[in-house]
């Protein structure tokens, strides 16, 4: 555990401790003194730390930042793999904890859990075969991807796999079933009549998190999985296969867990820390595993098993990738191969394993019981070329600038933690583990979390996901800072991400989208409700179609695809850093929060329209059952004038009154806190955002009101429309409480 | 240097066996498909079998269907071919090539090209 404070107060000690009631008027008077004392001092040390020269301040941390620091650091930490539960990531942390130590933080400390990991078996290989008819293999899927040169001699290298497959060995016919979403099972099962029970499925990654392939499959009967890459998804045109480029190669293959785990970290210890004491679950009833064998494969060896699929034709365009095969949706293979059955061979088995979170201390000058959280995660599939380690580089040189300030006798106002994460890769485990046990602190101390994973996707503007309540200071931070962009020399970011990511409802300023999950805030956000965000470099979504970044996840993503083809100057990877570490900076640093809820009100608004509009495709229903939004518009409008308000009141009150100032924080800390409901969304009890929520459909994508949006989901199917309806009603009843709760939170205290 | 070197060849007595290695070095080995191609006397150049980069697939010429075995250390950079119950027809001086797609399997192809060939070791099987 870590321990920021020393709560050992002497003077309130003593005060319990009363002598003689001849004493009062010197405790009294003495009393007044140390009033006075302590209110002097608070604003002689809120002022010495952050409101002499706050420009300066700032300034000095950013000008700190070294585009060559991270890049040494990149090098650094991808020489070999550190995949989660490994010694050599193991060494890593205690290399982080030692570095951080020496940059000045003010304590280090690792903390470890057991949690349930998966591995493939070292002798015993997963892989895809063709059977014919007499049951031999004539035609086997890669054991391992080719390794890049350079890297041929590098052990514990893991072969690609699907990270928490049971066991199994299915044969059966082929069904492709295009992306595996929920709309592509109701395209083929509905439309097209199909069935997939009995059946191994293949789909190709892309548009949604895999885990949500995986369980969309198995409500379809599907034996088992194979996810393959296609170069329409991961090729970009008229770019090379690395290493001549940044595409991926024919035997390059995305590895990834297919947990759904719904927000509760470990699978075995749902709700609590995975220490040494901690009750686990058997597996069979584990958190979130699949119940059918999956395996990842390249597209070359897809090719192989898709050239000879039969069945039915591919419904239109959108089901076909960029393989020369006629993407027939089977089942089974064409005429002369329709003996040949597809079979898995998967043997991978998962175990209880310990991971370390490093977890570094800037303590908070003026309010050290109020947290500032920046974390990203150090495990990675391989290299972790940009995933992670492009982020944790960044965070190296953030903390080391920061460590540069405190050495010079400058303290945060408040306190900034620091944290390198374990088994982000298999379900967040790490971040999540951690909360668990801390979350008594971080609901009551938590301020904000910014997250630091991968800090490219690409090199073309920057993307950012951010609770409303952060859009104004990222809105600010980036007009302050210059543009890395050609063609945009002199200009500021926020000029450069205008103009390439405009907002699709707002003109003149740039895109901000939902947070949704797939990374480590989700347990601070989307559980405790502490105000989040992230931030890094992406592609061009228009003309760049494929998903995430070619090499995701493969033994290819290395040092050498990022100095060679992503940001050779690193210029990218320090934009980030001072986006990263500037929102920390002000967020630890400004005396007034840098929230601001009208903003939030806004998108309540936006919210509330969006899910009228998708209920409004019923109206009949709607009559029938009687559903309104009356309440909820009732509730947005009443957040909007308290919220309104509120700002008011934030820009006029007296910011030397050290307890006016206190309950004015609190207010805009505690906001985010108000939107959470403690019994969670249906079925997923860890996901207590009312506002937002990960898709059900697709864990990477932010959901608004999703306790509405997925009561109204495919409602035209259910077998009892009452109930169905009846549902609607209770989420907007829900969604109503929490909106105008939250508005009273910011109402005036007395 | 990029090269290949094979070894083991020699003069065997029909229904023996003879182990012939192909050692690789200057280039990513264990990145590649390989090759063993054999010559005999005054004859073309006859493909004999292929295994892919990572050894999940390997193809033989009917010919040796069930009699010889591909196999590869990539930690050896080393590629080998078991040959059992040699035949007189067998006689040839084997080479070992490498394929030129980098992990692409060409097994089933009905031509190859090599882009890096060995200089040869002789298999004699004469009673």
């Known amino acids: 555990m870590w321990n920021l404070l020393h709560e050992t107060d002497s003077a309130v000690a003593t005060a319990r401790r009363p002598r003689w009631l001849c004493a009062g008027a010197l405790v009294l008077a003495g009393g007044f003194f140390l009033l006075g004392f302590l209110f002097g001092w608070f604003i002689k040390s809120s002022s010495e730390a952050t409101n002499i020269t706050p420009k300066h301040n700032m300034k000095a941390f950013l000008d700190e930042l070294k585009a060559e620091n991270i890049k040494k650091f990149l090098h650094n930490f991808t020489q070999i793999p550190h995949l989660a539960g490994t010694e050599q990531n193991f060494q890593l942390a205690k290399q982080i904890q030692s570095q951080w130590k020496e940059f000045g933080l003010d304590s280090v400390e690792l903390t470890h859990y057991d949690v349930l990991l998966s591995y493939p078996n070292k002798t015993h290989p997963n892989y895809i075969s063709i059977i014919n008819e007499d049951g031999n293999e004539i035609f086997n899927t890669s054991l391992f991807e080719p390794p890049p040169a350079g890297y041929e001699n590098v052990s514990d290298i893991v072969p690609p796999f699907s990270a928490f497959s049971p066991q199994g060995m299915p044969e059966g016919d082929l069904v492709y079933v295009n992306y595996a979403r929920t709309e592509d099972f109701f395209k083929l099962e509905r439309d097209m009549k199909i069935n997939c029970s009995g059946k191994i499925v293949i789909a190709r990654y892309g548009k949604v998190f895999r885990g949500n392939k995986v369980k969309n499959a198995q409500l379809a009967g599907a034996t088992g999985v194979i996810l393959y890459s296609d170069p329409a998804d991961y090729f970009a045109p008229g770019v090379k296969s690395y290493p001549d480029g940044w595409n991926l190669p024919g035997g390059g293959v995305q590895r990834g867990n297919i947990l759904n785990l719904n927000g509760a970290g470990d699978p075995l210890t749902p709700g609590y820390p995975a220490n040494e004491y901690a009750y686990r679950r058997g597996i069979a009833e584990a958190v979130g595993l699949p119940s059918i064998p999956v395996h990842p494969i390249g597209y070359y060896d897809a090719q192989k098993l898709l050239e000879k699929m039969g069945g039915s034709a591919s419904p239109d365009s959108s089901w076909r990738g960029s393989l020369k095969v006629p993407y027939n949706v089977g089942p089974g293979f064409t005429g002369n191969f329709s003996t040949q059955k597809v079979k898995m061979h998967i043997h991978s088995t998962s175990e209880v394993t310990r991971i370390y979170n490093v977890i570094g201390t800037l303590r908070g000058a003026v309010e050290p019981d109020r947290y500032v959280i920046l974390g990203g995660h150090r495990d990675s599939w391989v290299f972790g070329g940009i995933d992670p380690q492009s982020g944790a580089a960044v965070v190296h040189e953030i903390v080391r600038s920061f460590g540069t300030l405190k050495k010079e006798g400058w303290r945060p106002r408040r306190t900034i933690l620091f944290a390198s994460w374990d088994a982000e890769e298999f379900g967040l485990l790490g971040s999540t583990e951690w909360a668990e046990e801390n979350s008594r602190l971080l609901q009551e101390r938590g301020v904000a979390y910014i997250n630091a994973d991968s800090s490219i996707e690409g090199n073309y503007t920057l993307r950012v996901d951010c609770t409303p309540l952060m859009y104004s200071l990222v809105y600010n931070l980036t007009k302050e800072l210059e543009s890395p962009d050609e063609g945009f020399e002199g200009k500021s970011l926020y000029e450069s991400w205008t103009k390439k990511s405009p907002s699709p409802e707002f003109s003149g300023m740039p895109r901000i989208s939902k947070l949704g999950s797939g990374n480590d805030f989700e347990v601070f956000f989307q559980r405790l409700g502490i105000a989040s965000g992230r931030a890094r470099y992406t592609k061009n979504w228009e003309t760049n179609k494929f998903s995430s970044y070619p090499l995701y996840h493969s033994v290819y993503e290395t040092y050498e695809l990022v100095e060679k083809f992503y940001d050779p100057m690193f210029k990218y990877h320090l934009t980030v850093a001072q986006v990263r570490g500037g929102m920390v900076f002000e967020l630890a640093n400004s005396v007034v929060l840098p929230f601001d809820c009208r903003d939030y009100a806004v998108v309540l608004r936006k919210y509330a329209d969006k899910i009228y509009n998708i209920s409004m495709k019923h109206p009949q229903e709607m009559k029938t059952y009687s559903v309104s939004f009356d309440s909820l518009f009732s509730a947005v409008k009443n957040f909007t004038e308290i919220a309104s308000k509120f700002s008011e009141r934030l820009r006029d009150f007296d910011k030397s009154n050290p307890i006016l100032l206190r309950m004015m924080n609190d207010q805009l800390m505690f906001l985010e806190r108000a939107f959470i409901d403690p019994l969670g969304l249906p079925d997923r009890p860890f996901y207590r955002h009312v506002i937002y929520a990960p898709s059900s459909h697709n864990k990477y994508a932010g959901e608004s009101f999703p306790g509405i949006y997925d009561a109204l989901f495919d409602i035209e199917s259910k077998v009892d429309p009452s109930q169905a309806w009846g549902e609607v009603k209770r989420q907007i009843s829900i969604a109503t409480f929490t909106v105008q709760a939250a508005a009273e939170t910011l109402s005036e205290v007395a | 240097e990029v090269q290949l070197v094979e070894s083991g060849g020699g003069v065997v007595q029909p229904g023996r066996s003879l182990r012939l290695s192909c050692a690789a070095s200057g280039f990513s080995f264990s990145g590649y498909g390989q090759h063993w191609v054999r010559q005999a006397p005054g004859k073309g150049l006859e493909w004999v079998a292929y295994i892919s980069y990572d050894a999940s697939n390997k193809y033989y010429a009917d010919n040796v269907k069930g009699r010889f075995t591909i196999s590869r250390d990539n930690s050896k950079n080393t590629l080998y071919l078991q040959m059992n119950s040699l035949r007189a027809e067998d006689t040839a001086v084997y080479y070992c090539?490498?394929?030129?797609?980098?992990?692409?399997?060409?097994?089933?192809?009905?031509?190859?090209?090599?882009?890096?060939w060995g200089q040869g070791t002789m298999v004699t099987v004469s009673s």
């Open positions: 090539a490498k394929d030129p797609a980098w992990g692409l399997r060409l097994g089933e192809s009905s031509s190859y090209d090599f882009d890096i």
